[in-house]
Amino acid sequence: LRPSRVYKPEGNTKRALTLKDILNGTFSYKTYFPNWISEQEYLHQSEDDNIVFYNIETRESYIILSNSTMKSVNATDYGLSPDRQFVYLESDYSKLWRYSYTATYYIYDLQNGEFVRGYELPRPIQYLCWSPVGSKLAYVYQNNIYLKQRPGDPPFQITYTGRENRIFNGIPDWVYEEEMLATKYALWWSPDGKFLAYVEFNDSDIPIIAYSYYGDGQYPRTINIPYPKAGAKNPVVRVFIVDTTYPHHVGPMEVPVPEMIASSDYYFSWLTWVSSERVCLQWLKRVQNVSVLSICDFREDWHAWECPKNQEHVEESRTGWAGGFFVSTPAFSQDATSYYKIFSDKDGYKHIHYIKDTVENAIQITSGKWEAIYIFRVTQDSLFYSSNEFEGYPGRRNIYRISIGNSPPSKKCVTCHLRKERCQYYTASFSYKAKYYALVCYGPGLPISTLHDGRTDQEIQVLEENKELENSLRNIQLPKVEIKKLKDGGLTFWYKMILPPQFDRSKKYPLLIQVYGGPCSQSVKSVFAVNWITYLASKEGIVIALVDGRGTAFQGDKFLHAVYRKLGVYEVEDQLTAVRKFIEMGFIDEERIAIWGWSYGGYVSSLALASGTGLFKCGIAVAPVSSWEYYASIYSERFMGLPTKDDNLEHYKNSTVMARAEYFRNVDYLLIHGTADDNVHFQNSAQIAKALVNAQVDFQAMWYSDQNHGISSGRSQNHLYTHMTHFLKQCFSLSD
């Protein structure tokens, strides 16, 4: 037996991080996103839960809604009506899936200083929102959409087809919520509040995933979710638009699907209002390499929405799937005809293009061996976007302004030189026409949020600088973080290495690889974090590495689409390549290398452990996918095609974790899953376990009863990280 090793950070008054610090969230940071209500006004919820109004120009601020009013209904969120007469207060938050939740809503009349009585809202509500002007309300209750002209009015029921687990109006079903829309809603007001567009999802023919929820009762209850796995029947989707001022006159009008899309299975992917009578819909073939953007206009004479063929714009990928993780959405110009959109250029890098008439005639606005990530705002004279261009680091985000009024357009990096060491990863929040904006910097130093003038980019004030966190970290020994690249053959892999305090290159350290590796993901980011792996480096002296292999995002389509139709191959290969390179660096103890990951990372870590290379001593898979046939259709098929003989069934079968069960014999494997995982079903781990048992391979396992994909309840999370820590320390012969 090898003697146990204890890592002791040398002579320093600072203390190491403890696991308790991490589990208690002691070193969590704050961000500040203004809730914009005009060009120069915003709301923000204060530390003590008052809702405070701010006017940037007059510098006035006052409480518009007191914490006592919030507390009177136990409100945790709020929304001001655009006419500023009412506020909805949200309470009884009850989480459903990743984005969805139900809640109770109360309407507070700011003018009268009292809650609106009469025609009170039903409960629980699945979604509620104000119209963009005035104080109309749209809400979804029991899968149907309702409208209120004013908060105290009787409701008007727009849809009647809603039925639990069958038909969803105005809210997505499970698969659309998780894999397509990434929202809890599927309804959109027109800019003037006249029309309401919504989606109807018909899940009647979708197979059901059923799992037990144990609760406290004598009998478990069964959770049933219509969940299309790869190759299964998908939701049938229809888009409607209703005139909310006079909904009875015509009733909801269906928006036609483009012919080239409707000819086979398809998805609705997003809706963007262009003007009060023009709407843009995006559709996607089930084989997700063809996307169609369709611009539709209201025809008063027909009482219908017309989507002419010459207003259909096709986006197609010949090397993989359309878009990044999702197909990008258009940012329309003031003319309500032309728009800016991010898609791959001829070199396979995602860049901003300007489309005036056809995609073929698109004008490329940005270019280079980097990628445009997101278009924040298009105004009369400026376009604001984020990219990873600066200094060639894919894991950074800076905000740029292109002056589109100028010819040729001029580009300026707004954030590159603001706080160069502290801030290399930004997002932004703009007022309506970008007169002002907030920058939120996520790192690599302490996060900081600042307010800026939209014309001059001048910093007006610091909104949040995390001073308390800075103070509390003064006596903590944080690890050193490096972001570098390594080369192998013609490939370049970016990695992040977290090195223990007083790291000494001449010594040998255990290595833990943290992997996610899913298509279009990114792990190597210049962001601040104090989490479990920070603790492992700080206290336990473990070197941590994260590597972005092929299939990860923002480095061009050649790198991204390498994994197309063959998931589970290059993602794993590139982690192994990186480990070999790390060993060559000389400070890694080859006998003590582990890998861990969650979700897609659990899949990759499992396959890496079963690679037969002997590189890993042990590893952990939390909530892993074990076969792409078990996962959602929209996700699996985007990257793998269909699990049919004439398509890609063969690779579906040979990319499973179960197929490699024999190869786990020489590693210590810890398999963990929540039994109430609605996303990556417990079935995945159950099948791995069955295959390992059948192969007579010993392994460790832990399940978390009634926990979902996040295993996020306080007690479970504490148990999970404590358990994984013990497993790792045992693997690395580190004493407790």
Epitope: K136, Q149, R150, D153, F156, T244, T245, P247, H248
Partner: antibody
Framework: EVQLLESGGGLVQPGGSLRLSCAAS????????MSWVRQAPGKGLEWVSA????????YYADSVKGRFTISRDNSKNTLYLQMNSLRAEDTAVYYC???????????WGQGTLVTVSS | EIVLTQSPGTLSLSPGERATLSCRAS???????LAWYQQKPGQAPRLLIY???SRATGIPDRFSGSGSGTDFTLTISRLEPEDFAVYYC?????????FGQGTKVEIK
């Protein structure tokens, strides 16, 4: 309290014109569809016309199309009904009503009587 | 247009009794888009029910509506003296909106 007050009714000869007004108070007038509904003496109710909040769209019963014009002035919180080419069968009490979603009516004004007779 | 026929034309009942008023449509009223009103002599109509069964604000719970398709009912569970009036049904499921001819509930 919501109040609707009609005025402008009276006796008019066939072929003549009349303009009805409805003054609204106690609610955000500019947010609502508004309608006129009439009731001939001793008879039932008949919807006449409706107008959307912006005034941009108007709707009429076939029996009055081309003769009546509904309009509104949101700055004055007032609804109007211009009645031209009046006929004996237009004789009725005319009510203005807050119109929910182009559906039901609530509340109604007290009504104004229009008598078309020679 | 949809024609609404109310029956009976007149209903003679005593206070405390149950009143059942019927409204039949010439064709199906989509999504139960039907309202009921009460009108007393010399007064404007007053909304009782919308959406076939939803009570308007301030309306006592002795008033209830039911039905769908072509057959709708207004029920007054126990007649109070102030309930004696004319009752109208109105459909708003298709254009133009139309009313029934009314049912008069009188004291027996």
């Amino acid at each position: 309290e919501v109040q609707l007050l009609e005025s402008g009714g009276g006796l008019v000869q066939p072929g003549g014109s009349l303009r009805l007004s409805c003054a609204a108070s106690g609610f955000t007038f500019k947010s609502y569809v508004m309608s006129w509904v009439r009731q001939a003496p001793g008879k039932g109710l008949e919807w006449v016309s409706a107008i959307v909040p912006s005034g941009g769209d108007t709707y009429y019963a076939d029996s009055v199309k081309g003769r009546f014009t509904i309009s509104r002035d949101n700055s004055k919180n007032t609804l109007y009904l211009q009645m031209n080419s009046l006929r004996a069968e237009d004789t009725a009490v005319y009510y203005c009503a807050k119109d929910y979603y182009g559906g039901w009516f609530d509340p109604w004004g007290q009504g104004t009587l229009v008598t078309v007779s020679s | 247009e949809i024609v609404l026929t109310q029956s009976p034309g007149t209903l003679s009942l005593s206070p405390g009794e149950r009143a059942t008023l019927s409204c039949r449509a010439s064709q199906s009223v989509s999504s139960s888009y039907l309202a009921w009103y009460q009108q007393k002599p010399g007064q404007a109509p007053r909304l009782l029910i919308y959406g076939a069964s939803s009570r308007a604000t301030g309306i006592p719970d002795r008033f209830s509506g039911s039905g769908s398709g072509t057959d709708f009912t207004l029920t007054i569970s126990r007649l109070e003296p102030e309930d004696f009036a004319v009752y109208y049904c109105q459909q708003y499921g298709s254009s133009p909106r139309t009313f029934g001819q009314g049912t008069k509930v009188e004291i027996k």
